[in-house]
């Protein structure tokens, strides 16, 4: 058992049929002595009476707010919640694993330059009686400081007959240089409770490996006299880093037909602008990537050819 | 074919096309040896992020660009040492940060050069014979060096007595080549910065 | 005490379908969740699938994907094991078995598929 | 096929002491635990050992467990008739959990 906050435990359980559980001994934070009693949860059932109170917990009808009165008034209240083990891995019933970019994703996260300012996001199909709680800081064995924002709904989707819900969190490196070299990951740490269950999931990166630039903007598209090509040009998007020849990108390029099936011509340049040859109904596309780095590409800014 | 993009002309400073070969080799050479060394642990994950430039150079500090100077974080550590003009500084006037910040990453080259070398040759001498650095990489960092053209002591090759132990030298491969991927990306910038400037 | 009793096994055709049941008693079945592991005569173990203890998740070996289906009523405390298109290759005895650092099994049920 | 890899059969006299190997990985048994079971003929898989080298109460101490690395060992000293089996490590990957990866199996032979 161990202290999550004031007057909040977290009981961890080896988690199977018949499991003995864990023998947890709750103190009343009072002076008195005699005529104390302890109940749990809105129950009126006295569990016990004296100072301390000791307790089996097996499964979730053990975990509550257990709270110790004396005359009919409260004196302390312990919230115990459970942290269930199942054969030695600790269970992730609260999120869903987002599968990408491999199995057991549970956070993901991504940075739009090398400021040191990033956001994860999480997925569940818990509507209710839920609560996060997000930690952050680069290594663990000697932390540097990350401030992490307010965790907020972020998304809502309906998915076939659940609802799924996505929770994000900004967060931001105390004192990040965008031209550093990583050495120790960024490590971030979500605490999830619903109703008497407690579940932490990790994420450890390195900030140049979650970089995901936003789209290059101002995408203009200048037909040339007399020719069926046109001069594209766009720029580097608002949020990068700056100066921009030494946090360069490589962009690529494509024209679309009106059909998904046509076939698309796809190029890479350093440059931001090219020469396409652009029919009618057809689109041009930009996407931006560090030229020197191979993280994610950037979502595609987009054009209509006529 | 619908797109076509202009090529640009010969780069006025000559290291960067260099640099940009650094770093496919570095990136190339990191990608085999994952693959052949794939029940080791090689992946970014799994390997301890070490510098072995660490107190020897300083060339992320050295070559900030100037934006980032007024930036405190930036700023943990300067090292001045006497500079010698090398070729890539050919006819602009540079400053002595210029002059500080290539000289730093010919000494980047010349340590991993040496730790490379010096790990190759226990590699060699692996029964398995599962892994060995092919010479683009070596060769690679050598034109640099060479484009760069500072006059400099010789790091001695380091010998090793003992019998090497193969496991321990192959994890040690990946991590040298992890963060020889990193510094090559910083030399990269550096090169494109200082072209543009 | 624990008690785990499979049923529904039998012979049956290739291509045609056939359903396990695990009925579970002694402990809340509800909380935990549930595998069903398959072994061929004269074969090894090989697990074929699970189920999270609220049903939420499913997860299944790659041999029985998309024609085996596991479920669970909590209500009734037994588990299911819906399998179509079956082939000769599922002939084997099912056990299903509780997840958990000290697993229960139960005594398994044979299933034969041939014509 | 099966990911762990056990030896197809040890054998040793009765007293003796026999230890039967399973090897993995380091996204299976170098990240989880290990369990190990006992199938006597006709009979399910009774376990003997979770996490690693525990046993469960009325498993006799003759039986014991060890991980190391990518690979997990159980010994069994003082062999006996009864303990004539077939014997199956078992664990986990960490990127397919909950799925159960089981050994190869091994067929323990007492001689004599």
């Known amino acids: 058992i161990w202290e999550l906050k004031k007057d909040v435990y977290v009981v961890e359980l080896d988690w199977y049929p018949d499991a003995p559980g864990e023998m947890v001994v709750l103190t009343c934070d009072t002076p008195e002595e005699d005529g104390i009693t302890w109940t749990l949860d809105q129950s009126g059932e006295v569990l016990g009476s004296g100072k301390t109170l000791t307790i089996q917990v097996k499964e979730f009808g053990d975990a509550g707010q257990y709270t110790c009165h004396k005359g009919g008034e409260a004196l302390s209240h312990s919230l115990l919640l459970l942290h269930k083990k199942e054969d030695g891995i600790w269970s992730t019933d609260v999120l869903k694993d987002q599968k990408e970019p491999k199995n057991k994703t549970f956070l993901r996260c991504e940075a739009k330059n090398y400021s040191g300012r990033f956001t994860c996001w999480w997925l569940t199909t818990i509507s209710t009686d839920l609560t996060f709680s997000v930690k952050s800081s680069r290594g663990s064995s000697n932390p540097q400081g990350v401030t992490c924002g307010a965790v907020t709904l972020s998304a809502e989707r309906v998915r076939g007959d659940n609802k799924e819900y996505e929770y994000s969190v900004e967060c931001q490196e105390d004192s990040a240089c965008p031209a550093a070299e990583e050495r120790l990951p960024i490590e971030v740490m979500v605490d999830a409770i619903h109703k008497l269950k407690y579940e932490n999931y990790t994420s450890s990166f390195f900030i140049r490996d979650i970089i995901k630039p936003d789209p290059p903007k101002n995408l203009q598209l200048k037909p040339l006299k007399n020719s069926r090509q046109a001069e594209v040009s766009w720029e580097y998007p608002d949020t990068w880093s700056t100066p921009h020849s030494y946090f360069s990108l490589t962009f690529c390029i494509q024209v679309q037909g009106k059909s998904k099936r046509e076939k698309k011509d796809r190029i890479f340049t350093d440059k931001t602008s090219a020469t396409v040859i652009c029919r009618k109904n057809a689109s041009f596309s930009v996407q931006a990537q560090d030229r020197y780095y191979s993280s994610s590409w950037s979502e595609w800014a987009s054009v209509p050819c006529s | 074919r619908n797109l076509s993009v202009a090529t640009p002309g010969p780069e006025m400073f000559p290291c960067l096309h260099h640099s940009q070969n650094l770093l496919k080799a570095a990136s190339n050479t990191l990608q085999k040896a994952r693959q052949i060394l794939e029940f080791y642990p090689c992946t970014s994950e799994e390997i301890d992020h070490e510098d072995i430039t660490k107190d020897k150079t300083s060339t992320v500090e050295a070559c900030l660009p100037l934006e980032l100077i007024k930036n405190e974080s930036c700023l943990n550590s300067r090292e001045t040492s006497v500079i010698t003009k090398g070729s890539c500084l050919a006819s602009r006037k540079t400053s002595f940060m210029m002059a500080l910040c290539l000289r730093s990453i010919y000494e980047d080259l010349q340590i991993y050069q040496v730790e490379f070398k010096t790990m190759n040759a226990k590699l060699l001498m692996d029964p398995k014979r599962q892994i060995f650095l092919d010479q683009n990489i070596l060769g690679v960092i050598d034109e640099l060096m060479q484009a760069l053209n500072f006059n400099s002591e010789t790091v001695p090759q380091k010998s090793s007595l003992e019998e090497p132990d193969f496991y321990k030298t192959k994890i040690r491969l990946c991590i040298l080549l992890h963060a020889f991927r990193i510094r090559a990306v910083t030399i990269d910038r550096v090169m494109s910065y200082l072209n543009a400037s | 005490q624990v008690q785990l009793v499979e049923s529904g096994g039998g012979v049956v055709q290739p291509g045609r379908s056939l359903r396990l049941s695990c009925a579970a008693s002694g402990f809340t079945f509800s909380s935990y969740g549930m595998h069903w592991v398959r072994q061929a005569p004269g074969k090894g173990l090989e697990w074929v699938a699970f189920?999270?203890?609220?049903?939420?998740?499913?997860y299944y070996a790659d041999s029985v994907k998309g024609r085996f289906t596991i479920s669970r009523d909590n209500s009734k405390n037994t588990l299911y094991l819906q399998m179509n298109s079956l082939r000769a290759e599922d002939t084997a005895v099912y056990y299903c078995?509780?997840?958990?650092?000290?697993?229960?099994w139960g005594q398994g049920t044979m299933v034969t598929v041939s014509s | 096929q099966s990911v762990l890899t056990q030896p197809p059969s040890v054998s040793g006299a009765p007293g003796q002491r026999v230890t039967i190997s399973c090897s993995g990985s380091r996204s299976n048994i170098g990240s989880n635990t290990v369990k190990w079971y006992q199938q006597l003929p006709g009979t399910a898989p009774k376990l003997l050992i979770y996490?690693?080298?525990q046993r469960p109460s009325g498993v006799p101490d003759r039986f014991s467990g060890s991980k190391s690395g990518t690979s997990a060992s159980l010994a069994i000293t003082g062999l006996q008739a009864e303990d004539e089996a077939d014997y199956y490590c078992q664990s986990y990957d960490r990127y397919t959990h909950p799925a159960l990866l089981f050994g190869t199996g091994t067929k323990v032979t007492v001689l004599g």
């Open positions: 078995k509780t997840h958990g650092s000290h697993d229960n």
């Open positions: 996490y690693n080298d």
């Open positions: 189920i999270r203890y609220d049903g939420s998740n499913k």
